[in-house]
Interface confidence: low
């Protein structure tokens, strides 16, 4: 007869909640006379999980028939798993004995940990804009997940982002866990219609990942470029300005008008034009009569974009000589 | 810097036995099981076993059962294998590993040469 | 216990060239598998494990895929310190098993 050998051929039993588990245990020889009992976990704390002779165990039953004679298999199946059962199951060789049995040999034990999928990942960006050629971060989160092991991945447009630093928490052994990684990304001026994705590979997935999506649109301010262009004089003294505010986003965009430095008009951009990479273009005219006046116009076009600080374009209106001669024959 | 610091080269006569050491350092040791790994002269790997420092659990691999004994010391970090009942055929290479997650091996020992001769 | 089979026994490929690398496992080990790179004299080094998850400081050229009974370990461009004997190892079960091996040699 061989020397007793316990034998648990798995190390790591992932489980669903909800599922059935199996714990195998096989013993080498019948020898010595004793039962084989399952307890959780080790030392003088363990749960008793079955035993054959005594106890209640109303989730336990046995693969096969306990009490045929050359059995060799304690094997055991446990029904409805919730979290709770998590732990290191070991079926344990008992030598007969009086007035108790004791313990003569442990199987190395089988890890039962839960087998669950993570949330949808959720992915977030900066809480304030930023410009072009500035760096804003991205926060992806997922939860939920056992086993430990996962696998994250950033993508920015479809291609591989590596400026990332991920987090599995807890460290130590769990029920379950959760993914919190953050990317680093430099905007470009095309970004509005970029997109970040968060993609997550775990063991439960079946090699059909999960992502999460954010757009750089709510992450990006692209200021805008001015220009102020005087039209040729019309008839009746009048001079059309043009004032165009190009590629900007988004589009919260307030422009004021001041004559001389007082304010003749304010407008909120209104009818846009969207280009291609998703910016918007503004024009805005302002036809000033020349006729009446006698000294030159600094005309001042103030463009608020955002809720950022107001830049300024100016313009002289330069009034001719024999204008000036008129308005001040008029001023007579 | 996780370290597996393996005894020297060994040569046996049939029918004894050989003891190998493997010394961890850069890491806790209790932590993380250890499995021996061995490789015949031009042949592929060969799981022998694997054992835990914390609890002393072993386990082996069939074609080793009764001949291969792993045990630890704790208190140097060191866990050691015994092979007994030495044929000519268990002239190999001597790996310790250390087991990540009780499932594959991310660090190995530089390897313990025994040589079984008559 | 489950038997890992690699295949070819060896792949000659030039520098710079795609490698693929194949194993199969006897029965499901669902994505617990992991691949080891060995030199002439050196102990194996863990390359990739979960199926497809990179050792801490392996470069991206060497990328895994597969799952169930189906693995494959490719190198996008063969530099010339990956020529070397390649394994792959089962976890899903004791006892752990390796594949015999392929040697990747330079064509």
């Known amino acids: 007869e061989e020397e007793l050998q316990m034998i648990q051929p798995e190390k790591l039993l992932l489980v669903a909640v909800g599922e059935s588990a199996t714990l195998n245990c096989t013993v080498t020889s019948l020898l010595p006379v004793g039962p084989v009992l399952w307890f959780r976990g080790v030392g003088p704390g363990r749960e008793l999980i079955y035993n054959q002779k005594e106890g209640h165990f109303p989730r336990v039953t046995t693969v096969s028939d306990l009490t045929k004679r050359n059995n060799m298999d304690f094997s055991i199946r446990i029904s409805s798993i919730t979290p709770a059962d998590a732990g290191t199951y070991y079926c344990v060789k008992f030598r007969k004995g009086s007035p108790e049995n004791v313990e003569f040999k442990s199987g190395p034990g089988t890890e039962m940990a839960l087998r669950a999928k993570p949330s949808a990942p959720v992915v977030s960006g900066p809480a304030a804009r930023a410009t072009p050629e500035h760096t804003v971060s991205f926060t992806c989160k997922s939860h939920g997940f056992s086993p430990r092991d996962i696998t994250l991945k950033w993508f920015k447009n479809g291609n591989e982002l590596s400026d990332f630093q991920t987090n599995v928490d807890p460290a130590g052994q769990s029920v379950s866990y959760s993914i919190r990684s953050t990317a680093r990304v430099v905007l470009a001026p095309w970004d509005v219609r970029s997109q970040v994705t968060c993609e997550v590979a775990h063991v439960t997935l079946q090699g059909d990942p999960l992502r999460g999506t954010a757009n750089l649109s709510e992450a990006i301010r692209v200021p805008p470029t001015l220009e102020v262009t005087q039209q040729p004089m019309r008839a009746g003294n009048q001079v059309n300005i043009t004032y165009q505010v190009r590629n900007f986003y988004p589009q919260n965009l307030q422009l004021t008008w001041l004559e001389n430095g007082n304010v003749c008009r304010t407008e909120t951009a209104s009818t846009l034009t969207e280009n291609k990479d998703g910016t918007y273009n503004w024009t805005s005219w302002l036809l000033v009569n020349t006729s009446d006046q006698r000294d030159d116009v600094v005309l001042t076009c103030q463009v608020k974009h955002d809720g950022q600080l107001a830049v300024n374009k100016s313009l002289v209106l330069e009034v001719s000589a024999h204008q000036k001669d008129q308005s001040s024959d008029a001023t007579h | 810097q996780v370290q597996l610091v393996q005894s020297g080269a060994e040569v046996k006569k049939p029918g004894a036995s050989v003891k190998v050491s493997c010394k961890a350092s850069g890491g806790t040791f209790s932590n993380y099981g250890f499995s021996w790994v061995r490789q015949a002269p031009g042949q592929g790997l060969e799981w022998m076993g694997w054992m835990s420092p914390s609890s002393g659990n072993t386990g082996y691999a069939q074609k080793f059962q009764g001949r291969v004994t792993m045990t630890r010391d704790t208190s140097t970090s060191t866990v050691y294998m015994e092979l007994s009942s030495l044929r000519s055929e268990d002239t190999a290479v001597y790996y310790c590993a250390r087991e990540r997650s009780g499932s594959y091996f991310d660090y190995w020992g530089q390897g313990t040469l025994v040589t079984v001769s008559s | 216990e489950i038997v890992m089979t690699q295949s070819p026994a060896t792949l000659s490929v030039s520098p710079g060239e795609r490698a693929t690398l194949s194993c199969r496992a006897s029965?499901?080990?669902?994505?617990?598998l992991a691949w080891y790179q060995q030199k002439p004299g050196q102990a194996p080094r863990l390359l990739i494990y979960?199926?497809?998850t990179r050792a801490t400081g392996i470069p991206a050229r060497f990328s895994g895929s597969g799952s169930g009974t189906e693995f494959t370990l490719t190198i996008s461009s063969l530099q010339s310190e990956d020529f070397a004997v390649y394994y792959c190892q089962q976890y899903g079960s004791l006892p752990f098993t390796f594949g015999q091996g392929t040697r990747l040699e330079i064509k």
């Open positions: 029965q499901s080990v669902s994505s617990y």
């Open positions: 979960g199926t497809s």
